[in-house]
């Protein structure tokens, strides 16, 4: 009985992100397994979150919108290993929107859904950022590794969106 | 006070090159970015490139891609557009301007008095 | 790309009176609250003279009866009393994604 609604609970659950989301890959996890936590068919999953990457060509307000619609915002980096991750689906020869950007130019750089800016888990290439008229943050291929460059935002890149998992 | 000259505009056949020039003077020329804008004979106004302050970032429009190279010679002030493989279309005046940016934006706030370049036979 | 699409191509208005020049974008220009949209300037023989940036903000040393307004996809400059060295084209333009795109332009006259 106990089991029988739990599905149920489940299946109206499913439904209800249907709507928003036509399909769902979902895991089970914790340590009875008896929760499944769920991305967007084809988003990647890395621990809590799902990521998407989008070769649509767009500006950073562009960009961001386009992940707003589905519930997500540009990517926000906030170890290392996150970035290990992301740049595995990546191409090396693109450029990405990260959710990071600098909209006075005070170099008072700022993610997307507030997190703390702090410059000791930043990924910069060398010499970067380098211009406070580059307002927005990209992550690219250079000198034999990926890293973060200062970039004007309204010149249209890929991007990166993220998502916190759906659990049922 | 802000100075743009241009120079180097001219006669061209179609297929041919030509190397424009902006002298700037007035501002610190090593911090801006900076655009060149084209405007065809009694026609509206056109964005052809732009290259950040330390020059190594640039961006053009397709219509140029492939075609026109921006540069810039911080030492000298000086900012540059190598125009290849010309058509007639690009019978224009030309003018250079300073960037400034608007929060995600940005506006185009000083012009030079421009260059004229024919693309004729 | 971003269309601008800026009406009327001309206009003619007595001295001292209100012009009005509108401009619509084929998509949204907006993020955060700004709306980024230019207004340039150009007097025959001369150079564009920037306006208006974001949509309403006066530049520096233009004369306050020129205003912008609008969000969204929908812009208008306005000149509320016409003056003879008003007589010039005006352009907006986009700067929220390259390339960035001007409007057709609109000749102002006086009648």
């Known amino acids: 009985n106990f089991m029988y609604s739990k599905t149920v609970k489940r299946l109206s659950k499913l439904q209800e992100y249907q709507q928003y989301y036509p399909s769902l890959t979902c895991v089970m996890e914790g340590k009875d397994m008896e929760d499944w936590s769920c991305c967007p068919t084809p988003w990647t999953s890395f621990q809590s979150s799902c990521y998407f990457i989008s070769t649509v060509m767009q500006s950073w307000t562009k960009s961001q919108n386009n992940c707003s619609v589905m519930g997500a915002d540009l990517v926000v980096i906030n170890t290392k290993e996150e970035q290990d991750f992301i740049t595995q689906n990546l191409k090396i020869n693109s450029a990405y929107f990260l959710g990071l950007s600098d909209p006075k130019g005070w170099r008072h750089w700022q993610w997307v859904d507030q997190t703390p800016y702090n410059k000791n888990v930043t990924f910069w290439h060398s010499g970067e950022p380098n211009s406070p008229d580059e307002r927005c943050a990209i992550i690219n291929f250079r000198s034999e590794e990926w890293g973060w460059n200062d970039v004007h935002c309204h010149v249209p890149q890929k991007s990166i969106c993220k998502m916190k998992k759906i659990y049922i | 006070e802000v100075q743009l000259l241009e120079s180097g505009g001219g006669l061209v056949q179609p297929g041919g090159s030509l190397r424009l020039s902006c002298a700037a003077s007035?501002?610190?020329?090593?911090?801006?970015?900076m655009s060149w804008v084209r405007q065809a004979p009694g026609k509206g106004l056109e964005w052809v490139a732009t290259?950040?302050?330390?020059?190594?970032?640039?961006y053009y429009p397709d219509s140029v891609k492939g075609r026109f190279t921006i540069s810039r010679d911080n030492s000298k002030n000086t900012l540059y557009l190598q125009m290849n493989s010309l058509r007639a279309e690009d019978t224009a005046v030309y003018y250079c301007a300073t960037y400034r940016p608007y929060y995600y934006g940005s506006v185009l706030d000083y012009w030079g008095q421009g260059t004229t370049v024919t693309v004729s036979s | 790309d971003i269309v601008m699409t800026q009406s009327p191509d001309s206009l003619a208005v007595s001295l001292g009176e209100r012009a009005t020049i509108n401009c619509k974008a084929s998509q949204s220009v907006d993020y955060d609250g700004n709306s980024y949209v230019n207004w340039y300037q150009q007097k025959p023989g001369q150079p564009p003279k920037l306006l208006i940036y974001?949509?309403?903000n006066l530049e520096s040393g233009v004369p306050d009866r020129f205003s912008g307004s609008g969000s969204g996809t929908d812009f208008t400059l306005t000149i509320s009393s016409l003056q003879a060295e008003d007589v010039a084209v005006y352009y907006c333009q986009q700067s929220d994604e390259d390339p960035w795109t001007f409007g057709g332009g609109t000749k102002v006259e006086i009648k």
């Open positions: 974001g949509a309403s």
């Open positions: 007035g501002f610190t020329f090593s911090t801006y970015t």
């Open positions: 290259i950040n302050s330390g020059g190594d970032n640039t």
